[in-house]
Every structure is written in C-alpha cells, then in structure tokens.
C-alpha cells in the first residue's frame, strides 16, 4: 500500500508511517516501527508536558521565586505547569507572572472601585458628588458625605471630593 | 544579558517637551515593569512613575502627573517617558530601571538640560 | 509620602575599617505579608546606581558578604564589615511599601 502522506489525530508521520503520539504527562522514548508501539515514559518528578506530543524532553515546572515576591497558586502535575502568584499586597506584571508589581492604592478624591488582585491592580474611581476619600488607600471605597439633617444639625462647611461636610448646631434665633 | 540602553543627553528650552527613551534587551519586556527614576545635580533620586508594558498601564507620582507620560512600545522593547512644560529644575539625570525583585537593572542615563 | 531619613550624610571611613549607615522611616515598612520592604543602592561615582540589598536584609547577587543590612519596621542599618576603597560612593536606602516609592537624601561614603 502507498505510505500514508498524513495521519490521524493523536498520530504524527515518521518513516513513512504513522506513530501514535505520547499523551500528555509522557514523553517519546522511542518512535514506532512497523512491529512495535510509540514508546513513552512519565516525565518525572517537577516536570510535565502538557499536549500529546513526541518531545523527547519534558518541560520544567517553573519556579515560583520568593525573591521575586512569588509564590505558588497551584502545585505542577505531570501535565501541568505550576501557577504562580504574588504575595500578598502585589500583583503580577503579566500573565506570564514572572516578576510583581506593588497594588497601587487610590489617592484622596478617589475611591476603590475594584480591589486589587493576583493578577489585576487597584482600579480607582473619582469620588462622586455627595462622597469623599480622605485618605491613600487600596481598600477604601467613596465614603457618603454625613447628613446634618438627620442629626438635627445644619451644613457649616460644605463637604469636597476629599472632605466631609462639617456639621454644627441649629440657629437658634430664627423667627 | 540584559541591558536598558537610553537615548542620549537632550538640551531644551523653558516650557518645552523631551521625550527619553529606553532599549531592554536580554530578557522578556512585558514580564517586568519599567520604572523612572531622576537626580537633579548634586541631588538625591527621585521616583517619577512606572510603565507595566504588559498592559500598558502607567502609575505616576502625583508630583509629575500632570507632566509625565511613560509609554512601551513592545514590537521595540523600548519603553519612554515624555516631561512637558519643562522648567529649569528638571534639569537632572534620567534613569529607566527594571523591577525584578528590585531596580536590579538600570540604564546608563540621560542628562537633561534645560535652559533658556 | 512616607519620608526616608539617612544618616549621617558624610562617612569619611579608613579601609579596613567598619561602616554603618542608618536609615529611619517615617511609617512601617513591615508589610503584613511579613517582608519588609526597604532595599539599600550604592551609586559610584559617575555611574548608575547598583543594588546592595533588597527586602531588609537579603544581599544581592554579586554583592560582596561584608555588606549587611538589618532593622526593624522603621529604623534600618547598612554595615560593611571592612570597607574597601571600591566602595566609596553615595548609598541610599528607599522603600516599597506603597506609592510614591521615596529615597533617602543618600550617605556619601569616602576613604579618610
């Protein structure tokens, strides 16, 4: 019979023949002949290979560097790579996440629309009218302006995007 | 090995723009953020902001906000820092910095002179 | 901002001899993840600062063993154990424990 020009999925073509490829978490030790099987091996420990393949070398787990402010999210299996993260307060800088960035935090007139995670930064927002933020911060959101009225109390000093209102006693010399 | 190449020294006039920029070679650019660091002469340093070329989200000092602009551009590796309404005292030395674990690489710097 | 104070500002040192530097902050630099975030750079004369030590005490790749930093949450020191004249330069220490990263004004360490 003519020698096959393609093969079938999970089959790649060598010799003119189509060898099963190795499953992922297995490596090729050896092609198939017209007599024998595609032989594979386990990657070993700290390794893995991820898609069928034929790759005669497994890929190493990364290394989640504590000196680089990482960690590991998720421990590496013979067909996964391990997932790192930062430490806490930081975030990675790519999805890569091979380095980390410090979670910003939101300057007074901003709030904390999102907090920051593994993986994305604080998002800020503008205080709106009738809220403020007086501080820096990466966990505070807008807090509402007090309302005088309902302490009995009238506006004295109007509140900003960074203050609140100042409250003070009624007049009492009303007619 | 990696290096951050800046462009070279820039003498400007009061009220004007310059726009530095920085060449990383030797490691993968969007896996680290580009920071700008300044020492006016005889002076301290002083931190201006960072670029995340990843995303291309920038974090500024409140002090440059409004004056600043950090940009990557990925297809170069270069990243850049633009100051605007440039006045006497920003007359200093610019450097770009890796962070890693640390500003564990820095470019060789650019002087910026400004002068009427 | 949180403000970084070195001292002293000159350090006229004999080589050979031991060298401490002290850098105070005007908050924390203990995150509550336990690192402390207080690095310390040397600037050489006519070059780019270099990284001496990172997180407090850790010393950097390449970095000779006579250097060595410590502290606490606001009070830090740079030692060097025996100075040598390739040493002599401007040392900062700064913080990252939140925006806008800060500096110390920088010790200026030179051979007596």
């Known amino acids: 019979p003519e020698p096959p020009t393609a093969c079938r999925e999970k089959q790649y073509l060598i010799n003119s023949q189509c060898c099963s490829l190795c499953q992922p978490g297995q490596k090729l030790v050896s092609d198939c002949t017209e007599f024998t099987e595609t032989e594979c091996l386990p990657c070993g420990e700290s390794e893995f290979l991820d898609t069928w393949n034929r790759e005669t070398h497994c890929h190493q787990h990364k290394y989640c560097d504590p000196n680089l402010g990482l960690r590991v999210q998720q421990k590496g299996t013979s067909e996964t790579d391990t997932i790192c993260t930062c430490e806490e307060g930081w975030h990675c800088t790519s999805e890569a996440c091979e380095s980390c960035v410090l979670h910003r935090s939101c300057s007074p007139g901003f709030g904390v629309k999102q907090i920051a995670t593994g993986v994305s930064d604080t998002i800020c927002e503008p205080c709106p009218v009738g809220f403020f933020s007086n501080v820096s911060s990466a966990f505070e959101k807008c807090h509402p302006w007090t309302s005088c009225e309902t302490k009995d109390l009238v506006v004295q000093q109007a509140g900003t995007n960074k203050t609140d209102v100042v409250c003070g006693p009624q007049d009492r010399l009303r007619a | 090995e990696v290096q951050l190449v800046q462009s070279g020294a820039e003498v400007k006039k009061p009220g004007s723009s310059v726009k530095v920029s920085c060449k990383a070679s030797?490691?993968?650019?969007?896996?680290?953020?580009m920071h700008w660091v300044r020492q006016a002469p005889g002076q301290g340093l002083e931190w201006m902001g960072y670029i995340n070329p990843s995303s291309d989200y920038p974090n500024y000092n409140q002090k440059f906000k409004d004056r600043v602009t950090l940009t990557a551009d990925k297809s170069t590796s270069t990243a850049y820092m633009e100051l605007s309404s440039l006045r006497s005292e920003d007359t200093a030395v610019y450097y770009c910095?890796?962070?890693?674990?640390?500003?564990?690489?820095w470019g060789q710097g650019t002087t910026v002179t400004v002068s009427s | 901002d949180i403000v970084m104070t070195q001292s002293p500002l000159s350090l006229p040192v004999t080589p050979g001899e031991p060298a401490s530097i002290s850098c105070r902050s005007s908050k924390s630099l203990l995150h509550s993840n336990g690192n402390t975030y207080l690095y310390w750079y040397l600037q050489k004369p006519g070059q780019s600062p270099q990284l001496l030590i990172y997180r407090m005490s850790t010393l950097a790749s390449g970095v000779p063993d006579r250097f060595s930093g410590s502290g606490s949450g606001t009070d830090f020191t740079l030692k060097i154990s025996r100075v040598e004249a390739e040493d002599v330069g401007v040392y900062y220490c700064m913080q990252h424990l939140e925006y806008p990263l800060t500096f110390g004004q920088g010790t200026k360490l030179e051979i007596k």
């Open positions: 030797g490691y993968t650019f969007t896996s680290y953020t």
């Open positions: 910095a890796r962070w890693g674990y640390s500003f564990d690489y």
